[in-house]
Interface confidence: low
Amino acid sequence: SQVSQNCHNGSYEISVLMMGNSAFAEPLKNLEDAVNEGLEIVRGRLQNAGLNVTVNATFMYSDGLIHNSGDCRSSTCEGLDLLRKISNAQRMGCVLIGPSCTYSTFQMYLDTELSYPMISAGSFGLSCDYKETLTRLMSPARKLMYFLVNFWKTNDLPFKTYSWSTSYVYKNGTETEDCFWYLNALEASVSYFSHELGFKVVLRQDKEFQDILMDHNRKSNVIIMCGGPEFLYKLKGDRAVAEDIVIILVDLFNDQYFEDNVTAPDYMKNVLVLTLSPGNSLLNSSFSRNLSPTKRDFALAYLNGILLFGHMLKIFLENGENITTPKFAHAFRNLTFEGYDGPVTLDDWGDVDSTMVLLYTSVDTKKYKVLLTYDTHVNKTYPVDMSPTFTWKNSKLPNDITGRGPQ
């Protein structure tokens, strides 16, 4: 049913869904703090622009009785229940900030007539791609997939002279929400990644992964997995690894690699870590002081969601345009706005663009070093370290298939 929006006459409300099931196990209080910090900034920016309006947030909590698993598996209906609650209360804001679980976002998008924008900190799965009124402020699976294909094909760098066309993917079902959807995208037979690779096998058991490390008959030297170094160690331990093996560890929302005193453990020498380039002005902010690096990204996405709304509100008000229109609902894309920690760029489909960083472990210093960066906005790789001190032979990444000569 059509719900009236609290979104006119100088008063603009943001509906924030506070769901029990969330992409990251973050106390809702921290997300509230992030939203409130964002509101303060937005009010200041609007005031500076001479716009004398009120901006508030309404936090909508689910009752937690039915949907209490805490992870995303039971989130499908929770989002719809919250929307029903909003509908019954006739209390919808100009924008919906909320569902982070792919299941709930997909279902809400499907089951509602969305005449308002929806901003998500999460919704990583391919099923949430190309949604006209959905904006995602944490890197979705599609962006990861495009990087991997780009990197696999690259063969003109001093440290990567072979195109790759094969891969193993380790996916055992215990992954965090972000990793689950990243690996799901790589596994999907109809995805861009699968389409571009000649050989891809999913390893689902620890033993399968462990066996591949020294299997002379393996079909690929490259293994993709998702998680942190500790996750890898639990799986790999101190087992011997064939010298041609390259493990790509996807760990996007973790900036521990960049801390000054971090030393890479020995088991990381065959590993390339894919992460996001970290910002640096968050560390002292009131809402992030007690957050782990991953949770900082999650809370930051909520905060940036508020700043994005403020950015769009300012533009529409300055142009004398109505906020409760399809034009506003579809406007949250193809733009750059001033985020909390620097500029944030959204692509044509409302998905955040970022700089991904591929790290390697220097055999000299035992430190993580930047091998290359990748700008998701232009789908381009920028080499950084032209003569890396790799563990691999001749300081070059091996071919993906043992025994295959230069291509």
């Epitope: 750059t336 500029p343 950084v384």
Partner: nanobody
């Protein structure tokens, strides 16, 4: 509070030179991205030249080989040396800065953004190149 103040703009004949300066105050970030962004009448803002805290510089294709960005950390001043100026360089030139990221290549990516959204801006200085 961060403040950026540009100077050095003016009118010049095609082929001539100008040197823009940007005095920065209140800027305490150790990792930053700073540079020059211009806006011609009726057009979007575009990055011209950027420099990161690690010294990495990057230029828009249209000014490569003609413009040079530099900084004097002791004076907290940013410069843009503009040589071989063309009429299409006519624009308002803004000094812009942000605590963007720790690595220079991330700063460089700002040059490829439409309307780069830096956190701090100067008021701008007008450059007019006549043929």
């Amino acid at each position: 509070q961060v403040q950026l103040e540009e100077s050095g703009g003016g009118s010049v004949q095609s082929g001539g030179s100008l040197r823009l300066s940007c005095a920065a105050s209140g800027y305490t970030y150790s990792r930053y991205c700073m540079g020059w962004v211009r806006q011609a009448p009726g057009k979007e803002r575009e990055g011209v030249a950027l420099i990161a805290s690690d010294g990495t510089t990057t230029y828009a294709d249209s000014v490569k080989g003609r413009f040079t960005i530099s900084q004097d950390n002791a004076k907290n001043t940013l410069y843009l040396q503009m040589n071989s100026l063309k009429p299409e360089d006519t624009a308002m030139y803004y000094c812009a800065a942000d605590a963007v990221n720790w690595y220079g290549s991330i700063c460089a990516s700002m040059i490829r953004r439409k309307n780069p959204a830096f956190g701090y801006w100067g008021r701008g200085t007008q450059v007019t190149v006549s043929s």
